[in-house]
Amino acid sequence: SSCGQVKCRKGEQCVHTASGPRCFCPSPRDCESGCASSPCQHGGSCHPQRQPPYYSCQCAPPFSGSRCELYTAPPSTPPATCLSQYCADKARDGVCDEACNSHACQWDGGDCSLTMENPWANCSSPLPCWDYINNQCDELCNTVECLFDNFECQGNSKTCKYDKYCADHFKDNHCDQGCNSEECGWDGLDCAADQPENLAEGTLVIVVLMPPEQLLQDARSFLRALGTLLHTNLRIKRDSQGELMVYPYYGEKSAAMKKQRMTRRSLPGEQEQEVAGSKVFLEIDNRQCVQDSDHCFKNTDAAAALLASHAIQGTLSYPLVSVVSESLTPERTQ
């Protein structure tokens, strides 16, 4: 119904009031709910109303505004500090102590974050985005610099329906359409072999506690696991001779361990250095990501930071020790 210049929506009635004609919803059941468009941001709850805009938002602090779009910094919150002597003593010993696994303590001096002391260094959001990994979308953190809010703004994160099958057939040079989705890792790009690669700038350099032969044997699972976390596809980089860039890594033992090793007499034939793991160089191929998502990494910096963020949360399924992003073509370093 309408009266004068006012156009009322389906189910609404036009009421003449002292301040002119107004639309009114006699029965919210029969009217379009203003909550249908999910207007309340940052976890605010939406309540249907009988008058325009037909909703009201109950905002979760520190947000306010008609759509919870405004961030209000809490009054004079003192900056968090890492006061504990315990944490000072335990930082950078290669072991993650949960009690020190906080932003203020640099994630136990990098022990909990793959040696990266501030994965959110480039995040300029007014929110402390490391505290907003909470299974709900926080738009102020949904930027590449803020690590896409840990991919919590992707709607309900779907799981791969035929996960076991897709894991077994990942990157096997045969396209399985049932696995050709973001949640299944796009079948390791098996269905995109005819498409041009779309490489992110830079290289991810990862140290993982698996010897090279074991890592290469398990490469498909390894790449799928990391690709799942990064919502894109990864591949092992090749050197100028076309060889896969997976090298033995001999570790960086603590001073105490080095001393113990030196005092232990070497047996005949015993190797000088034991292989502790592998250093692997990875590239990001966004050829499928860019078709399905606007949350793709243009370079490897934020991808490295996101892996560090997963280490902080304890959600890595491989024994990663460190991750760095290299911008230039690396020399073979160990």
Partner: antibody, heavy 122, light 107 residues
Amino acid sequence: EVQLVESGGGLVQPGGSLRLSCAASGYSFTSYGMSWVRQAPGKGLEWVSYIYPYSGATYYADSVKGRFTISADTSKNTAYLQMNSLRAEDTAVYYCARHSGYYRISSAMDVWGQGTLVTVSS
Amino acid sequence: DIQMTQSPSSLSASVGDRVTITCRASQSVRSFLAWYQQKPGKAPKLLIYRASIRASGVPSRFSGSGSGTDFTLTISSLQPEDFATYYCQQYYISPSTFGQGTKVEIK
């Protein structure tokens, strides 16, 4: 199959020394932290010490600090507990146990050995 | 050090009973709490970690809940093989500490 086997327990006089061994198999030894946990006869469990074989970082309970030394030989996939200046109150079954969370001391212990008895008595 | 207090120290129950054991920490350990089962002469066995996650191979009748300072282990329907001693353990801050144990006996 992931397995831990302790050895080296026995009877020792107060003030004496003993070295316990924990041989690990069925998993990547360097990747996971390892703890020693003890249980005095008829009593509860007490955490003793932790090592992360990859970095060599070690942690100790105050009750054993300065007397016990934990170490690991990654070429043998074996963790050790060197116990010096032993006291009667160190009498217990000693278990080695693997931590479930790679380099995280803040993780539960998901695999345990069968235990080895240490008796400190004159 | 963080003190862990279990209650009760012992309890008698019958097969099929619902059994609840509580564990209280002297300060918050967030959700970094595990439950272990130990039978006489055997090593402890991990049942629950991160307060509520069942370890691999643990029957669904075992469940854990709680966070901060108060935690509960529940056995929904006690089976003959469940008669044992149960320990809680906080692993939030070193030194890791255990509760004194709860012995579950046959009534």
